[in-house]
Interface confidence: medium
């Protein structure tokens, strides 16, 4: 495996794997047999005084018999070559380690004894230093001997771990939080008889250390890959491990930068913007006038939008946000702006009435236009006789009293609204004064 980057304040070094206790970093792939290690529990027996622990010391000494001049026989022992005493097998194999190889088909373990020579295993059969057909969660006792060591033999207790496929590393991240959090959890997907108190879990994610079955990493960067190595130990011996590289989900896009928004005409507006830095799929543009709200979905490649069919001389509040559809839809912060559309001619006054108040006087009234479309409010009345303008009045309200008209004359009354920028279409009524009653 390649070295992992060193976290701040600490250096991490990956060195070649040694054939001892298993702390390899990744599970083997491509076969049905996986290797896991654990050093076997010791049941150490100390040699008793006077035992045969040193009985081989003189095996290579030769005895010679010589006759002395007196004829008496003298037996002398001459040491030609001596061999150091052999260790006991208990001493020699005190630190023996075991790799547990799991067969997914048979669901049985093979214990591989990590020794340099072919040992004998007493009443257990071992072939090429392997003890076969071990059931998960059951202890097996192996008595190890070899001609290079003396009694007592090494009694090895094989503490067989649970089956590997009974554990599954599960991604427990909530989709709503998957942009900034990672949750990983070891699940027991099948039951086993091993004491769960003897099982410990370790995680290492970057420079974070966890001694839990479930971990939750928070305040992460969106769209980043995080590597977590995990291992499960049985009686403090690792028997399975897994590495997961998890990429955090797309985060909420940033806020678009509005360059400008303004009204180009009475019925039109324009907004231009720069997109946010983070990934996103589309924009939502909403424009609000008074209590009415309209929203549009805009293509991600747009940086300008022309708003049509707007109401003249109206304040529009615009909000623009980007969104991304990831594991869930995430909306970015909205950028806001506002403008007031340009003025336009107002609509026509309505419900205009002309009534005679005396022989030569008229009372003209009307209702305000539906759309003022401008900043000011002024009502105008033009009175024509023939083609001649005889009166031109302006009031704040549409309520005109026209006096001193000619008797028995046809008049045209034109009432219209002026918004300070534009006049509206006039409402026209014809009315005649009567013949004077006096």
């Amino acid at each position: 495996q390649s070295p992992t980057p060193s976290p701040t304040g600490v250096s991490s070094v990956q060195t070649p794997h040694l054939p001892t206790h298993a702390d390899s970093q990744t599970p083997s792939a491509g076969t049905d047999t996986q290797t896991f290690s654990g050093s076997a529990a010791n049941a150490k027996l100390n040699p008793t005084p006077g035992s045969n622990a040193i009985s081989d010391a003189y095996l290579n000494a030769s005895e010679t018999t010589t006759l002395s001049p007196s004829g008496s026989a003298v037996i002398s022992t001459t040491t030609i070559a001596t061999t150091p005493s052999k260790p006991t097998c208990d001493e020699k194999y005190a630190n023996i380690t075991v790799d547990y190889l799991y067969n997914k088909e048979t669901k049985l373990f093979t214990a591989k004894l990590n020794v340099n020579e072919n040992v004998e295993c007493g009443n257990n059969t071992c072939t090429n230093n392997e003890v076969h057909n071990l059931t998960e969660c059951k202890n097996a006792s192996v008595s190890i001997s070899h001609n290079s060591c003396t009694a007592p033999d090494k009694t090895l207790i094989l503490d067989v771990p649970p089956g590997v496929e009974k554990f599954q590393l599960h991604d427990c991240t909530q989709v709503e939080k998957a942009d900034t959090t990672i949750c990983l959890k070891w699940k027991n997907i099948e039951t086993f008889t091993c004491d769960t108190q003897n099982i410990t879990y370790r995680f290492q994610c970057g420079n974070m250390i966890f001694d839990n079955k479930e971990i939750k990493l928070e305040n992460l960067e969106p769209e980043h890959e995080y590597k977590c190595d995990s291992e499960i130990l049985y009686n403090n011996h690792k028997f399975t491990n897994a590495s997961k590289i998890i990429k955090t989900d797309f985060g909420s896009p940033g806020e678009p930068q509005i360059i400008f928004c303004r009204s180009e005409a009475a019925h039109q507006g324009v907004i231009t913007w720069n997109p946010p830095q983070r990934s996103f799929h589309n924009f939502t543009l909403c424009y609000i006038k008074e209590t009415e709200k309209d929203c549009l979905n805009l293509d991600k490649n747009l940086i300008k939008y022309d708003l049509q069919n707007l109401k003249p001389y109206t304040k529009y509040v615009l909000s623009l946000h980007a969104y991304i559809i990831a594991k869930v839809q995430r909306n970015g912060s909205a950028a806001m702006c506002h403008f007031t559309t340009k003025s336009a001619p107002p609509s026509q006054v309505w419900n205009m009435t002309v009534s005679m108040t005396s022989d030569n006087s008229m009372h003209v009234k009307c209702r305000p236009p539906r759309d003022r479309n401008g900043p000011h409010e002024r009502y105008h009345l033009e009175v024509e006789a023939g083609n001649t303008l005889v009166r031109n009045e302006s009031h704040k309200n549409c309520d005109f009293r026209v006096k001193d008209l000619q008797y028995s004359t046809d008049y045209t009354f034109k009432a219209y609204f002026h918004n300070g920028d534009y006049p509206g279409e006039p409402f026209i009524l014809h009315h005649s004064t009567s013949y004077n009653s006096k």
Epitope: G9, V10, H17, A22
Partner: antibody, heavy 119, light 107 residues
Framework: QVHLVESGGGLVKPGGSLRLSCAAS????????MTWIRQAPGKGLEWVSY????????YYADSVKGRFTISRDNAKNSLFLQMNSLRAEDTAVYYC????????????WGQGTLVTVSS | EIVMTQSPATLSVSPGERATLSCRAS??????LAWSQQKPGQAPRLLIY???TRATGIPARFSGSGSGTEFTLTISSLQSEDFAVYYC?????????FGGGTKVEIK
């Protein structure tokens, strides 16, 4: 009972080297992650280095990275710290300690060995 | 690097009294915090791990509390053998870091 005994400390000149040893007994050495921690005279504790069960994963504090090397000999129940390019600020009592079985803190410590770097 | 700050630096207490030691982390270490005791000329001894779990053989008068960034070690009734220096240590992140220590002395 668990017993950790450090050795190899002494007086050395700046730029010199020392090799510390830690002999472990009373527990199955190969089953435990091990560490070195130091304590400058009259000062607090500073973690130095950490080694996994077989030595395949090793960590160093930045202050010693590139100068110190941690290793272990599981057959001999021994932990080592090779210290090169020693500096005055490396003067301290060096403790070897055993990592607890289920958490990354240290449940047993040796008595320490004093390393003095001085010209 | 997570900086561990212990206070006070020195605490003077009479035997039989209660002692409260504080440890603050520069960022959250969850409950991954240990307390150790060191007597002069001796190696440190583990008292508490997981912020509140007593290590094997540690008397019940020692208790730990806290999580995140604020932690407390309480010695309910000080015995003569409790006068020592106490260190907190975080094991949430590499590098592992210790506090500067609190010396508990006889008043």
């Amino acid at each position: 009972q668990v017993h950790l005994v450090e050795s190899g400390g002494g007086l050395v000149k700046p730029g010199g080297s020392l090799r510390l040893s830690c002999a472990a007994s009373g527990f199955t050495f190969i089953n435990y992650y091990m560490t070195w921690i130091r304590q400058a005279p009259g000062k607090g504790l500073e973690w130095v280095s950490y080694i996994s069960l077989s030595g395949s994963t090793i960590y160093y504090a930045d202050s010693v990275k590139g100068r110190f090397t941690i290793s272990r000999d599981n057959a001999k129940n021994s932990l080592f710290l090779q210290m090169n390019s020693l500096r005055a600020e490396d003067t301290a009592v060096y403790y070897c300690a055993r990592r607890a079985a289920t958490v990354t803190t240290f449940d047993y410590w040796g008595q320490g060995t004093l390393v003095t770097v001085s010209s | 690097e997570i900086v561990m700050t212990q206070s006070p630096a020195t605490l003077s207490v009479s035997p039989g009294e209660r002692a409260t030691l504080s440890c603050r982390a520069s960022q959250s270490v969850r409950s991954n915090l240990a307390w150790s005791q060191q007597k002069p000329g001796q190696a440190p001894r583990l008292l508490i791990y997981g912020a509140s779990t007593r290590a094997t053989g540690i008397p019940a008068r020692f208790s730990g509390s806290g999580s995140g960034t604020e932690f407390t070690l309480t010695i309910s009734s000080l015995q003569s053998e409790d006068f020592a220096v106490y260190y907190c240590q975080q094991y949430n992140n590499w590098p592992l870091t210790f506090g500067g220590g609190t010396k508990v002395e006889i008043k």
